[in-house]
């Protein structure tokens, strides 16, 4: 059962796993949620009745029954992890804590103009977990405006104390705000020879990389595959770090793979969700339960629904045995990974999908793309919406993209002459415009947020957000698309599609069925040559065929330029302006979404 509220002046008795320090009960709950075993916690707030050494302690707890006895205690705040909840979870914490000094290893000290600048520095520093900033009112003159970047083994402070005129906060890497590079490549036959901070067992290099990503100290990893010569090291995932943040030595070794933490791209690729099945593989660990199940998929479901289950092994039924049901072994361990991985025993293993809600919804795999043709099929572009105006009569106005459960990203130029959000309707999960009838459900628009630097599409800043009146329930036909990662600025996208109902302001010819066209990206330099009378800025991105032959009219204004990268779709552009459709096939010009990620997050995450 999901319990989100905090219990004031209440302490859970027993079940202690470990104690960490957090600046608030709210953050203690997040830490508990991300811990592999924590189900409950007790946080101690600052209070005259409490020993100051116990202030800000966050005791992480576990219980076989998923609950513990409650005891009254002043200043104690208790609660449950969000593991039991089905809603989306984020580790992003933008709070600034006034008069708190969060202790850790102070590895970098520099002058900063503000706490915000200090937080940005922390976010863009590969080692930084949190920071403390001495304000200009700080008593000691030589420490004023000093920004201390800190890290710890756990990613949380080793202690928190009260200190006047300082502020503290966390890195915003988990808010997708880091400018650090996102290196997704996995390097075969490579060992990174740097210090190991931890080691776990993993079935493949991808799982190893994901484990590295959500381990606070891991910057890169080396994985020894099941063919690794040294038997005791097979399936071993070594989590590594170095002072420089990069591997100091790369050794060529067959059957080893290495890669980097995906911290700077974690909002746009799955890092918690290990959804694959591993055939002829047994995961060892503490046994939680043994249940009969029809298939390995059913076994994974059982594991996902059992809150303490972390991974499983399914042994298929022997012929005609037990009504064709096999055995499903639900398992757990102290760190969420198998204690050992064995091959050749016929088992099928995998992980709980409960952790998938810690990943952005947009990373979920959608149904395979239909190759060829120009008409889309249902569910092919589940983030695509049709924005209608009801004034003077109802009609399709622009395309748009779902980027959050209350947010649509579109083009600013769509709202020329739109006086009020009341006349707008957003329809999602639509394939044919003819499906829209008077009784078709839609989302009302609460607010139109246009970039304040927008003047006209051709001058850039052609971006707008629509805040919906109600939230979108994600389904196969309506779900979000990932924003590109700032760390992905140098990625060369090769699988890009423009979609829409073919409507452009000047050519009022609208298609009934959602159209799609695969189009290559064009460099800004090349694009500038095609538009000599317009400035193609780095905040724009161009796409289209050099020699014509593709109908760029398929993209509506405001609709998406969607590019698939590493199996995840990213909203690379917003259809903005250009001379497609005419005989001369100039590239289409799109708003370059990666350049507006900060703006989008600032607007959508505002309290």
């Amino acid at each position: 059962e999901c319990v989100t509220q905090l219990l004031k002046d209440t302490c859970f008795e027993g079940g202690d796993i470990t104690t960490v320090f957090t600046p608030s009960a709210k953050y203690c709950q997040v830490v508990c949620t991300y811990h592999p075993r924590c189900l409950l916690f007790t946080f101690t707030a600052e209070s005259p009745s409490e020993d100051p050494t116990r202030w800000f302690t966050c005791v992480l707890k576990d219980s076989v029954t998923e609950t513990l006895p409650r005891v009254n205690r002043t200043a104690a705040i208790s609660g449950y992890s969000f593991k039991q909840c089905s809603h989306q979870i984020s580790a992003c914490n933008k709070d600034i804590y006034v008069d708190l000094d969060m202790k850790g290893i102070n590895y970098n000290s520099s002058v900063a103009k503000s706490a915000q600048e200090c937080q940005e520095r922390c976010t863009d520093d590969v080692h930084c977990h949190f920071f403390t900033y001495a304000t200009r009112q700080f008593p000691s003159l030589e420490h004023r405006n000093i920004c201390l970047l800190k890290h710890t083994q756990t990613g949380t402070p080793t202690r928190i104390t009260k200190l006047d005129k300082v502020v503290s906060g966390f890195s915003l890497k988990s808010c997708a705000l880091s400018n650090l590079a996102c290196i997704r490549d996995i390097f075969p036959n490579t060992v990174f020879a740097d210090s190991n901070i931890d080691s776990v067992m993993a079935p493949d290099a991808f799982v190893c990389g994901r484990i590295c990503t959500h381990h606070p100290g891991c910057l890169f990893f080396t994985f020894f595959s099941q063919e690794w010569p040294k038997e005791s090291q097979r399936n071993l995932c070594l989590l590594k770090t170095s002072e420089s943040g990069l591997p100091s030595t790369r050794i060529k070794k067959s059957k080893a793979l290495s890669g980097f933490s995906l911290q700077s791209c974690r909002h746009s690729i799955p890092v918690f969700c290990h959804s694959s099945f591993y055939h002829d593989t047994d995961f060892l660990g503490e046994e939680l339960d043994i249940v009969a199940a029809k298939s390995h998929e059913a076994c994974q479901k059982l594991c996902t629904n059992a809150v303490r289950c972390q991974f499983f092994t399914y042994t298929p039924a022997q012929a005609s045995c037990n009504e064709g049901k096999g055995k499903c072994y639900l398992k757990l361990s102290s760190n969420g990974s198998p204690t050992k991985i064995l091959h050749g025993r016929g088992g099928i293993s995998g992980y709980t999908l409960r952790l998938c809600k810690m990943d952005n919804e947009c990373t979920t795999k959608i149904k395979p793309r239909i190759v060829g043709g120009t008409a889309s099929v249902r569910g092919e572009w589940p983030w695509q919406v049709t924005l209608h105006t009801t004034s003077p009569t109802q009609r399709h106005l622009c395309g748009g993209s779902i980027i959050g459960n209350q947010w649509i990203l579109t083009a600013a130029h769509c709202f020329y002459g739109v006086e009020s959000p009341k006349i707008l309707r957003v329809y999602s999960g639509i394939l044919n415009q003819s499906e829209i009838k008077e009784d078709t459900s839609f989302f009302g628009v609460q607010e139109i947020i246009i970039h304040d630097q927008y003047k006209m599409a051709e001058s850039g800043y052609d971006i707008a957000l629509l805040k919906l009146e109600t939230t979108v329930n994600y389904t196969d036909s309506q779900r979000p698309i990932c924003l590109p990662s700032k760390g992905d600025r140098n990625v060369i996208y090769t699988d890009c599609w423009v979609t829409g109902w073919g409507y452009r302001k000047l050519r009022d010819k609208i298609q009934n069925t959602l159209q799609k066209a695969k189009i290559p990206l064009v460099t800004n330099e090349e694009c500038q040559k095609r538009y000599r009378g317009h400035k193609i800025t780095h905040k724009m991105i161009c796409a289209g065929y050099r020699e014509g032959g593709k109908d760029a009219c398929k993209g509506d204004s405001g609709g998406p330029l969607s590019c698939k990268h590493n199996e995840v779709w990213h909203l690379v552009g917003i259809t903005s302006w250009g001379e497609g459709c005419a005989q001369r096939e100039r590239p289409g010009v799109y708003t370059n979404v990666v350049e507006y990620v900060d703006w989008i997050l600032e607007k959508t995450q505002a309290v």
């Epitope: 051709e458 000599r532 020699e547 014509g548 250009g578 001369r584």
Partner: antibody, heavy 120, light 107 residues
Framework: QVQLVQSGAEVKKPGASVKVSCKAS????????IEWVGQAPGQGLEWMGV????????NYNENFKDRVTMTRHTSISTAYMELSRLRSDDTAVYFC?????????????WGQGTLVTVSS | DIQMTQSPSSLSASVGDRVTITCKAS??????VAWYQQKPGKAPKLLIY???NRYTGVPSRFSGSGSGTDFTFTISSLQPEDIATYYC?????????FGQGTKLEIK
């Protein structure tokens, strides 16, 4: 009907500057690019640059980049081309022209041309 | 910059003749080719755009063809008023460039 009317002929000394105007009428001035093209006596046509009257954005040919300035005055639908540090080989007829499309294209309407003579 | 090489640089033909001028681009210019007519002391006039589209009011004896890098301008039956210099121009990539011109005279 669409018309581009240019200012009259000019005689200038080497080192001086000249500013040629081009007044547009009969269409929405901000919606089409204005190009400038030079033609030396007995020679071919050479593109000098373009101005977007809507945004004021300019793009110049490398050969003229450091000496040419294109501006516009939207309220009077007029574009200007100023060429500085004149040399005798700048003696030419300068044309303004409107592009056929909003984003560029062939030049469908031309001014009558302005002869600039550079002589000491 | 894309070079447009026009040939011949001059030609003499009789009234009623079929006249052909060619233009070769140094790289592909898609369909972004136009042809202009310029009479002495006058501004150029647009005749053909997008390789083969006749501009408004241009007589049907003027036509254009070609693709990629090779383009042809044709006057199917030369008239006395066609005496002028003809220019090709590419508009595919900035800076737009013109051919050096073909001066057409009547024999």
């Amino acid at each position: 009907q669409v018309q581009l009317v240019q200012s009259g002929a000019e005689v200038k000394k080497p080192g001086a500057s000249v500013k040629v105007s081009c007044k547009a009428s009969g269409y929405a001035f901000s919606n089409y690019l204005i190009e400038w093209v030079g033609q030396a006596p007995g020679q071919g046509l050479e593109w000098m640059g373009v101005i977007n009257p809507g945004s004021g954005y300019t793009n110049y040919n490398e050969n003229f980049k450091d000496r040419v300035t294109m501006t516009r005055h939207t309220s009077i639908s007029t574009a200007y081309m100023e060429l500085s540090r004149l040399r005798s080989d700048d003696t030419a007829v300068y044309f303004c022209a409107r592009t056929y499309g909003k984003y560029g294209g062939a030049m469908d309407f031309w001014g009558q041309g302005t002869l600039v003579t550079v002589s000491s | 910059d894309i070079q447009m090489t026009q040939s011949p640089s001059s030609l003499s033909a009789s009234v009623g003749d079929r006249v052909t001028i060619t233009c070769k681009a140094s790289q592909s210019v898609s369909n972004d080719v136009a042809w202009y007519q310029q009479k002495p002391g006058k501004a150029p006039k647009l005749l053909i755009y997008y390789i083969s589209n006749r501009y408004t009011g241009v007589p049907s004896r003027f036509s254009g063809s070609g693709s990629g890098t090779d383009f042809t301008f044709t006057i199917s039956s030369l008239q006395p008023e066609d005496i002028a210099t003809y220019y090709c121009q590419q508009d595919y990539s900035s800076p737009p460039t013109f051919g050096q011109g073909t001066k057409l005279e009547i024999k």
